[in-house]
C-alpha cells in the first residue's frame, strides 16, 4: 500500500513539475526590466527564451522574436537546450511511469518489469528536474552578470555626447516557476526510485519439496510464491509456468496448483 502511495505521489509530483517546466519554457518573463531607479516608465521590457516584449504605459504589448542575424548568445542556446531536454525526458518519464503504476494492470506484466519501469521513469524525472534547474540557473547567472555590469555602467555616456541610463534586468517570474518545477520533478523522481525498491521482488529462495507417492517421487517447485520459505534456491526469481509438477526422473505428473497463483 505504502509503495503504491509513494509511486502515485511521485507520479503526480513529477507531472506537476513537468507541467511547470513546460510553462516556464514558454513564459515570456525570464527577465524583467528593473524598475528600482525608474518606477514610472513609459515602456516596460521583459524577455523570454523565445521572444522579447515591450509593454507601453497605454497597456499595448508588442512581442517579437530575437535578432538572429549575427547568431544568438551561446548561453541562450544552452538554456533552450537544457529546458527542451528536460521536457523531453520528463514527457518520456511520464509515459513510462503510467505503465509502471501499480494501480494500473496491463496484461500479465510482472512486478519486476514494473519495478524496472518505475526506476527508469524516476531516473528520467531526476535528470529532467536537474536539466530545468541547470537551465534556469544558467539564465539567472547571465542576468546577475548583466545586472551588475549595467549597475557599474549605470550612467553610460554615448560616445561622450549624451548621458543615458542603461536598462537593467532582474529575475522574471519564469525563473521561479522553473526552479520550483525542476525541484518538484526531482522530488517526484526520487519518490519513484524509492517506490521501485518496494516493487522489486526480493531474492526468494525455494527448495523443491519432494512428496513421495506410491512408487515414484514427485518434486513440486512452487516458484510462484513471493514469500521466502527459507529452503534451497530459485535464484532467477521467476514464476515457473512449466505446465505441472515433474518427477525427479522427468516424468510429467499432474499440474501444480501453485503454477498460476
Amino acid at each position: 500500500m505504502a509503495v503504491t502511495a509513494c509511486q502515485g505521489l511521485g507520479f503526480v509530483v513529477s507531472l506537476i513539475g513537468i507541467a511547470g517546466i513546460i510553462a516556464a519554457t514558454c513564459m515570456d518573463q525570464w527577465s524583467t526590466q528593473d524598475l528600482y531607479n525608474n518606477p514610472v516608465t513609459a515602456v516596460f521590457n521583459y524577455q523570454g527564451l523565445w521572444r522579447s516584449c515591450v509593454r507601453e504605459s497605454s497597456g499595448f504589448t508588442e512581442c517579437r522574436g530575437y535578432f538572429t542575424l549575427l547568431g544568438l548568445p551561446a548561453m541562450l542556446q544552452a538554456v533552450r537546450a537544457l529546458m527542451i531536454v528536460g521536457i523531453v525526458l520528463g514527457a518520456i518519464g511520464l509515459l513510462v511511469s503510467i505503465f509502471a503504476l501499480k494501480c494500473i494492470r496491463i496484461g500479465s506484466m510482472e512486478d519486476s518489469a514494473k519495478a524496472n519501469m518505475t526506476l527508469t521513469s524516476g531516473i528520467m524525472f531526476i535528470v529532467s528536474g536537474l536539466c530545468a534547474i541547470a537551465g534556469v540557473s544558467v539564465f539567472a547567472n547571465m542576468l546577475v552578470t548583466n545586472f551588475w555590469m549595467s549597475t557599474a555602467n549605470m550612467y553610460t555616456g554615448m560616445g561622450g555626447m549624451v548621458q543615458t541610463v542603461q536598462t537593467r534586468y532582474t529575475f522574471g517570474a519564469a525563473l521561479f516557476v522553473g526552479w520550483v518545477a525542476g525541484g518538484l520533478t526531482l522530488i517526484g523522481g526520487v519518490m519513484m526510485c524509492i517506490a521501485c525498491r518496494g516493487l522489486a521482488p526480493e531474492e526468494t529462495n525455494y527448495k523443491a519439496v519432494s512428496y513421495h507417492a506410491s512408487g515414484h517421487s514427485v518434486a513440486y517447485k512452487p516458484g510462484g510464491f513471493k514469500a521466502s520459505t527459507g529452503f534451497g534456491s530459485n535464484t532467477k526469481n521467476k514464476k515457473i509456468y512449466d505446465g505441472g509438477a515433474r518427477t525427479e526422473d522427468e516424468v510429467q505428473s499432474y499440474p501444480s496448483k501453485h503454477d498460476y497463483v
Epitope: 522579447s52 542575424l69 555590469m149
Partner: antibody, heavy 124, light 107 residues
Framework: QVQLQQSGAELARPGASVKLSCKAS????????ISWVKQRTGQGLEWIGE????????YYNEKFKGKATLTADKSSSTAYMELRSLTSEDSAVYFC?????????????????WGTGTTVTVSS | DIQMTQTTSSLSASLGDRVTISCRAS??????LNWYQQKPDGTVKLLIY???RLHSGVPSRFSGSGSGTDYSLTISNLEPEDIATYYC?????????FGSGTKLEIK
Amino acid sequence: QVQLQQSGAELARPGASVKLSCKASGYTFTSYGISWVKQRTGQGLEWIGEISPRSGNTYYNEKFKGKATLTADKSSSTAYMELRSLTSEDSAVYFCATGVITTVIPTDWYFDVWGTGTTVTVSS
Amino acid sequence: DIQMTQTTSSLSASLGDRVTISCRASQDISNYLNWYQQKPDGTVKLLIYYTSRLHSGVPSRFSGSGSGTDYSLTISNLEPEDIATYYCQHYSKLPPTFGSGTKLEIK
C-alpha cells in the same frame, strides 16, 4: 563613460596596407560586437563588417571581403581593421561603432557609440 | 543587398517647423530600421531604432514611423542643434545598408 578611441590619420601609398585601431573603454569589451563603417568624402555610410570580441567571429560585407580584416585583442580592449592593397577608392573616414544593447538577449542591432573616425588617404 | 533610398538629399526648414525625412527600402525590411544623425563635425548619434523606438537620451521631438518598405523620421519642433545629415539604416539582412543621407539646413 562608454567611448571608442580611434587611431590617428593615415597616409599610405597605393598597394600598401594600413591597420586602424579602436580602443574601447567604459564597458565590458567582450559584451558587444564592434562594427566598422566607411564614409567617403561627401558620401554616405557603408558597413564593412563586425567582429564579436568574445568569440572572434567575424561578419563581412561581401564588398569588403579580401579588402578588410577584422581582429580584436581582449587584453587591451582594442579592435583592429587592416586594409590591404590600397587604392584611391579606399581614401575615406573609417568609423568603429558598437551597440550597447540594453536587453539581455539582443532584439535589435544598432550602433549607439561611435568612434571619432580615422581618415585614411591613399596617394602616390 | 537591400538598397535604402532617401529621395531628398537636402532639406531647408525654419526653426520650430515640423520636418519629415523619408526613406524607402528596395524590399520589406520588417521594421528593422534605425535612424542616425551626423553633425557637421562628423560625430554620429543614434536617434531611433526598430522604426519607432526612441534611443535613450534623445529628445522626444524626434519620432519614427513606417512599415514594409516605407519609413520616415519626424522632427516636430526644429531646433538649431538639429542641423545635421540624417541617415536611415536597415538591419533585416546582411549586410546592413545606409541611405545616402538627407542634409537638414535652416532657412
